[in-house]
Amino acid sequence: KESCDVQLYIKRQSEHSILAGDPFELECPVKYCANRPHVTWCKLNGTTCVKLEDRQTSWKEEKNISFFILHFEPVLPNDNGSYRCSANFQSNLIESHSTTLYVTDVKSASERPSKDEMASR
């Protein structure tokens, strides 16, 4: 099973529930052998994936795997959506599965009137 193909281990249909205002790191696990590939993140807009050019990213190296991290500092409500990472390797483009962020906007949630308040109006 071992191969020197680049592998991007984002799980299909993976989901993250996160709060607006919090910091969050979205990890793309990358397996490679010799040369680390060029990896990018994009955000899905319908069927197209829009490259995230101006976002802070970093690498974290572990023993058997590396992580290309997209930083959210802080998470914003419009960060809600699906993301994908892709790697350029020997002129091949390898795409990960998409992973979905569900952002809860704490401010708007706490400002929403309660059921009791609604009933008394």
Epitope: D5, V6, S96, S98
Partner: antibody, heavy 121, light 112 residues
């Protein structure tokens, strides 16, 4: 080599709860989905649900919502299936399985040997 | 839920002869990512299931090439070119495209 270790058998009284375990070796469960499948005597397979051990995110088949709770402990590389309010209908073999995602040659798949659960007074 | 219908229920085959199992889904298994998450499992007597084929036609490691998977959309087939004694057991198709994942009812392969 990847192995999934499950207890062989459990005998439980009706109305009680039980927690079945599945311990993975040769693999970090954070990189996988762990899922559980039910097989009643002389019958087919039913998908109960799955957990993403990396973040605790769970999904259940509607039929098992409220009956099953799936958890994971990444420090011990173990997934759990808790079944509540047991009846004779819950008498079955319960398999844990591990689904491992990559981008090109996808989806390695390993199954435990199953735990036979008998609900009887 | 997506209903997976397997035929036949039982298949009695002479060793060395071919075998074919059909699996039909109640809706298309083509996912939005362009892949079709249709697997075939074999459960030998007294054992846990073992996946043979994933993504319709890809053979798992160690699976002999006498097994082939084919199909698209809602119609899928597992073929064994020459049945061997170790092939006996119950074969299940299994879809992972739609939530919740669902299995076919199984086809029991027995040796004549």
């Amino acid at each position: 080599e990847v192995q999934l270790q499950q207890s062989v058998a459990e005998l439980v009284r009706p109305g009680a709860s039980v927690k079945l375990s599945c311990t993975a070796s040769g693999f970090n469960i954070k990189n996988t989905y762990m899922y559980w499948v039910k097989q009643r005597p002389e019958q087919g397979l039913e998908w109960i649900g799955r957990i993403d051990p990396a973040n605790g995110n769970t999904k259940y088949a509607p039929k098992f919502q409220g009956k099953a709770t799936i958890t994971a402990d990444t420090s011990s590389n173990t997934a759990y299936l808790q079944l509540s309010s047991l009846t004779s209908e819950d008498t079955a073999i319960y398999y844990c399985a591990l689904l491992y995602y990559g981008s090109s040659y996808d989806y390695f798949d390993y199954w435990g040997q199953g735990t036979t659960l008998t609900v009887s007074s | 839920d997506v209903v997976m219908t397997q035929t036949p229920l039982t298949l009695s085959v002479t060793i060395g002869q071919p075998a074919s199992i059909s699996c039909k889904s109640s809706q298309s298994l083509l996912d939005s990512d362009g892949k079709t998450y249709l697997n075939w499992l074999l459960q030998r007597p007294g054992q846990s299931p073992k996946r043979l084929i994933y993504l319709v036609s890809k053979l798992d490691s160690g699976v002999p090439d006498r097994f082939t998977g084919s199909g698209s959309g809602t119609d899928f087939t597992l073929k064994i070119s020459r049945v061997e004694a170790e092939d006996l057991g119950v074969y299940y198709c299994w879809q992972g495209t739609h939530f919740p994942q669902t299995f076919g009812g199984g086809t029991k392969l027995e040796i004549k």
